[in-house]
């Protein structure tokens, strides 16, 4: 019998390399059975995850998964950092792994680096 626990499918140590000025959607895939849980996004500040209030969020429904989306319209340099989603389910809090946004400020980049160039940056490799 399949578990009816809520599960949040963000990979551990995942990241996204994005550009300031672009729109971006950060997705939290949520698996649940009967009732969709309340889901929130927070941004890590040291060991504390600060809840993101008043941000544009939305739900997207697919066959056996829902996605709670945090919208960046557009991405700002200050959006750089690690984010986590959490679900409130049966008065328990289920937390996802954190995922990191590496924001390149296009003003300081002469051209957009490739994925391999992004991966070659020491701050990316060892963060």
């Amino acid at each position: 019998k399949e578990s009816c626990d809520v599960q949040l499918y963000i990979k551990r140590q995942s990241y996204h390399s994005i550009f300031a000025g672009d729109p971006f959607k950060l997705e939290c895939p949520v698996k649940y059975c009967a009732h969709r849980p309340q889901v929130t996004w927070c941004k890590l500040n040291g060991t504390t995850c600060v809840k993101l209030e008043g941000r544009h969020t939305s739900w997207k429904q697919e066959k056996n998964l829902s996605f709670f989306i945090l919208h960046f319209e557009p991405v700002l340099p200050s959006d750089n950092g690690s984010y986590r989603c959490s679900a409130n389910f049966l008065s328990a809090i289920i937390e996802s792994h954190s995922t990191t946004l590496y924001v390149t400020d296009v003003k300081s980049a002469s051209e957009r680096p490739s994925k391999d160039e992004m991966a070659s940056r020491p701050w990316l490799l060892y963060s």
Epitope: Y9, K11, R12, S14, H97, K115, A119, L125, Y126
Partner: antibody
Framework: QVQLVQSGAEVKKPGSSVKVSCKAS????????MYWVRQAPGQGLEWIGR????????RYAQKFQGRATITADESTSTAYMELSSLRSEDTAVYYC????????????WGQGTLVTVSS | DIVMTQSPDSLAVSLGERATINCKSS???????????LNWLQQKPGQSPKRLIY???KLDSGVPDRFSGSGSGTDFTLTISSVQAEDLAVYYC?????????FGQGTKLEIK
């Protein structure tokens, strides 16, 4: 069950490149990380790097940065590791492995590919 | 990089006896999520490595329960409670907490 099948043994000249493939079955590779490790004859294990097949982002050990390129093709469930500027010290068995990106609930290794670098 | 140091480099154990392999990391493997990403691999002669234990003490499916893992922070142990002939192998610890991933040098288990 999850299985990995790697390409066959290769003999290469110093200075050339080699590209090893690793085909996964029994899993949606979008839900995994795929990584590469090598083992020189009679030696221990050395981590080369890993890729997130969901978005193509790769991370590398500093030693292999700029010389190794890891890619993945989601449509064929295949990961690739290309190593350039080969030297004799690169003679080793190259293993690919795959693990569950969410809960680490599985970790499966391929059979290995022997790459011999010799003039 | 995190340095993983195993001891001993090799050990010979009689069938049915206990074998203990130690692994020490140069810094704590406790991740920010509260978990410790320390794995143990077994590599039998002429074969690919196979994960036995993950998250310090969780056994992979199909792994006999004579294998167990323990430890925290920087000090970890793999124990085989009653060594069998098929346990002849090299055992590696490796960490999945920080990049780059790093392995211990391996411990060769021989049967007396």
């Amino acid at each position: 069950q999850v299985q990995l099948v790697q390409s066959g043994a290769e003999v290469k000249k110093p200075g050339s490149s080699v590209k090893v493939s690793c085909k996964a079955s029994g899993v949606n590779i979008k839900d995994t990380y795929m990584y590469w490790v090598r083992q020189a004859p009679g030696q221990g294990l050395e981590w080369i790097g890993r890729i997130d097949p969901a978005n193509g982002y790769a991370r590398y050990a500093q030693k292999f940065q700029g010389r190794a390129t890891i890619t993945a093709d989601e449509s064929t469930s295949t990961a690739y590791m290309e190593l350039s500027s080969l030297r004799s010290e690169d003679t080793a068995v190259y293993y690919c492995a795959v693990y569950d990106g969410y809960y680490e609930s599985f970790d499966v290794w391929g059979q290995g590919t022997l790459v011999t670098v010799s003039s | 990089d995190i340095v993983m140091t195993q001891s001993p480099d090799s050990l010979a154990v009689s069938l049915g006896e206990r074998a203990t392999i130690n692994c020490k990391s140069s810094q704590s493997l406790l991740d920010s999520d509260g978990k410790t990403y320390l794995n143990w691999l077994q590599q039998k002669p002429g074969q690919s490595p196979k994960r036995l234990i993950y998250l310090v003490s969780k056994l992979d499916s199909g792994v006999p329960d004579r294998f167990s893992g323990s430890g925290s922070g920087t000090d970890f142990t793999l124990t085989i409670s009653s060594v069998q002939a098929e346990d002849l192998a090299v055992y590696y610890c490796w960490q999945g907490t920080l990049f780059p991933r790093t392995f211990g040098q391996g411990t060769k288990l021989e049967i007396k």
